[in-house]
């Protein structure tokens, strides 16, 4: 080994070196949190970049760059270091117009902490392993969601557009003439029934067990879907999103109530099956796989 390489190895294995890098990263993170950093922080920024460059050079000199088995670029953690340095120099010395987008990559410096703290490295390793193992479960989940999204599409397409419409119109007004002029919230509130404090018109349905309209109102299918048009089963993608919402139980009871009011109480069976399969079974299956991956990593 050349003297330069010997010195590099000595520096690399020294505990003070790791301590210096860790302190640098933490200090860098503190500086990154500043809202309006003073001008002198620019010099501090250069210092940080210098330390990171020094760290990488030491690693490259000690281990080699990329040819051998244990060289610098063969370790995925060093890819992060390399990217951090490349972006540091790019944002500083190359005029790329919209630099603010590239400055976002400075946040990657905080991730360097992972490679320095051994415990954290193990946890992240386990996380990556679990993601690899999750691929089969994810395929199963997406498949199940897709099947139920298709069923939902068939059962509830367009149903969430059912609204209670006022039974008194001007002489020149018809349902279609109103449909063509509905634009503002004011227009909607003029013609549709709203429960107090509700941002959406009261939903209704045409089957006997669905929601009925109050006196003076009739159920029609007009206008947009509830929640600014984001809640519906009108296309496969919206149905898939609704199913994902059921699986994650994200305010699912509202979707359940809306759909049952528009389609009929019989369809609660659909929701029972989805909640049992999607929410109770698949979510726990995902957790089990993650737990297994952590267990393996710890062993």
């Amino acid at each position: 080994f050349s003297p330069l390489r010997r010195i590099s190895i000595k520096i690399l294995v020294h505990s003070l070196f790791s301590m210096l890098i860790m302190c640098t990263i933490l200090t860098n993170c503190i500086f990154m949190t500043m809202n309006n950093p003073p001008d002198w922080t620019k010099n501090v920024e250069y210092t940080f970049t210098g330390i990171y460059t020094f760290e990488s050079l030491v690693k490259i000199l000690a281990r080699g760059f990329c040819v051998g088995e244990f060289t610098f670029l063969r370790d995925p953690w060093n890819w992060l270091d390399f990217v951090v340095i490349v972006f540091a120099y790019l944002t500083e010395f190359v005029n790329l117009g919209n630099v603010s987008a590239l400055r976002t990559f400075r946040v990657l410096r905080a991730l360097k902490t992972i490679s320095v703290i051994p415990g954290l490295k193990t946890i992240v390793g386990a996380l990556i392993q679990s993601v690899k193992k999750l691929s089969d479960v994810m395929i199963l989940t997406v498949f199940c969601l897709s099947v139920f999204a298709l069923i939902g599409l068939q059962l509830f397409m367009g149903n969430l557009k059912h609204k209670c419409f006022r039974n008194s119109l001007e002489n020149n007004e018809t349902l279609e003439s109103i449909m063509n002029t509905l634009e503002s919230e004011e227009d909607f509130r003029k013609y549709f029934y709203y429960l107090e404090g509700s941002k959406d018109a009261l939903l209704c349905g045409f089957s006997t067990d669905s929601g009925q309209c109050p006196e003076g109102y009739t159920c029609v299918k007009i206008g947009r879907n509830p929640d600014y048009g984001y809640t519906s089963f009108d296309t496969f993608s919206w149905a898939f999103l609704a199913l994902f919402r059921l699986m994650t139980q994200d305010y699912w009871e509202n979707l359940y109530q809306q759909t049952l009011r528009a389609a009929g109480k019989t369809y609660m069976i659909f929701f029972v099956v989805v909640i049992f399969l999607g929410s109770f079974y698949l979510i726990n299956l995902i957790l089990a796989v993650v737990a297994m991956a952590y267990e393996e990593q710890n062993q």
Partner: nanobody
């Protein structure tokens, strides 16, 4: 294709009576906001004559008040327009309008569904 069946039109003398009927008997017709009668006289715009909402409340054009009566038979899914004291200016093509919701089999659709029209001629 959704069809409204209108009948009862014809030639009548001034002061006479006619009863128009509009049947939305097809299973496609689910629920109306209103079913009404409109007319188009030669060289004029189509205008409302009378309409009846699904709860039974009625609405008449000024020219029809006191002379015309609109009614419905929910069991037969039919709306009637009883026209009394007819005048020559009542001569027009009378259209039935179902303004509400129909079923296409796959989904529900709300909108205006017009009949073909029945001709009423008032002349001596």
């Amino acid at each position: 294709e959704v069809q409204l069946v209108e009948s009862g039109g014809g030639v009548v003398q001034p002061g006479g009576s006619l009863r128009l009927s509009c049947a939305a008997s097809s299973r496609q017709f689910i629920r109306d906001v209103f079913t009404g009668w409109y007319r188009r006289a030669p060289g004029k715009q189509r205008e409302l004559v009378a309409r009846i909402y699904n709860e039974g409340n009625t609405q008449y054009a000024d020219s029809a008040k006191g002379r015309f009566t609109i009614s419905r038979d929910n069991a037969k899914k039919t709306v009637y327009l009883q026209m009394n004291s007819l005048r020559p200016e009542d001569t027009a093509l009378y259209y039935c309008l179902f303004s509400g919701t129909i079923s296409t089999g796959r989904e529900y659709r709300s909108g205006d569904y017009w009949g073909q029209g029945t001709l009423v001629t008032v002349s001596s």
